[in-house]
Interface confidence: medium
């Protein structure tokens, strides 16, 4: 097991704090444009999946969703926030890489039903989906935190 994996739980609060601080830089831009509050993209169903048996797969898939689909599109909506979004993407990639390296902590398999729904809604909402997904990024961080804290306790 890699040394970073042994210290992963200690590094966790700092990693999540970094994500939150970085999101603060762009939060207003996206949340002020996310006006479809009748729709919640990241529902409690996703959190249930994160905390379930196949949580790792769901977390990995959501990290990929944000790094590969949401952030690249979000970057096209505002030139003045590209640096912050790039940093956010790199932080998520770092988290994903750590999870992959420390695979003994995270058993990954099985496709996710909740994420299929999230992606369908995201696509259907078109540009509004970008503001929605980015506007709810704070919810995403909280869900990751709950998942990782749960893994740490096991």
């Amino acid at each position: 097991l890699e040394p970073t994996c042994l210290h992963f739980s200690e590094l966790l609060p700092a990693r999540l704090r970094e994500l939150r601080v970085k999101f603060e830089e762009i939060k207003d831009y996206f949340q002020s444009r996310d006006d479809e509050l009748n729709i919640q993209l990241l529902s409690s169903e996703l959190l249930d999946e994160f905390k379930g048996t196949f949580g790792c797969q769901s977390v990995s898939e959501m990290l990929r969703f944000y790094t590969d689909e949401v952030l690249p599109r979000a970057m096209q909506t505002s030139t003045s926030h590209q640096q912050s979004m790039g940093d956010l993407g790199n932080m998520l990639l770092g988290l994903k890489a750590t999870m992959r390296r420390c695979h003994r902590f995270f058993t990954c398999e099985k496709r996710s039903k909740a994420i299929k729904q999230i992606k369908e809604t995201f696509e259907k909402m078109d540009e509004n989906g970008i503001y929605k997904a980015m506007g709810e990024f704070d919810i995403f961080i909280n869900y990751i935190e709950e998942y990782l804290l749960m893994r740490r306790r096991k």
Partner: nanobody, 115 residues
Framework: QVQLQQSGGGLVQTGGSLRLSCAAS????????MGWYRQAPAKQREFVAS???????NYADSVKGRFTISRDNAKSTVYLQMDSLKAEDTAVYYC?????????WGQGTQVTVSS
């Protein structure tokens, strides 16, 4: 338990003005977006206006130039000044606030514009 307490509203003539207030029971909202939705009879709840902690505002096209949203972070309160009211502005108005995470809603307040 987080609560949003709304006040204002009532009956007003076409072309008149009203001011709605929404006070949050905790200052968490001074760091987050707050705003207003409305729901007319037999219609879906629709967006009216929002304001971020750094005063970025966003308005529905139907209220632009007539409604003004503002906030007082010290009081954790958001306001909606409604001028040049029309009959189609008649609805129950709900304030909302983004928490961490999720959305909190006020109890709603009736605004009736009579011609």
């Amino acid at each position: 338990q987080v609560q949003l307490q709304q006040s204002g509203g009532g009956l007003v003539q076409t072309g008149g003005s009203l001011r709605l207030s929404c006070a949050a029971s905790t200052n968490i909202f001074s760091r987050n977006t707050m705003g207003w939705y409305r729901q007319a009879p037999a219609k879906q709840r629709e967006f009216v206006a929002s304001i971020t902690r750094s005063d970025i505002t966003n308005y529905a096209d139907s209220v632009k130039g007539r409604f003004t949203i503002s906030r007082d972070n010290a009081k954790s309160t958001v306001y909606l000044q409604m001028d040049s009211l029309k009959a189609e502005d008649t609805a129950v108005y709900y304030c909302y606030a983004r928490g961490r995470p999720g959305i909190y809603w006020g109890q709603g307040t009736q605004v009736t514009v009579s011609s």
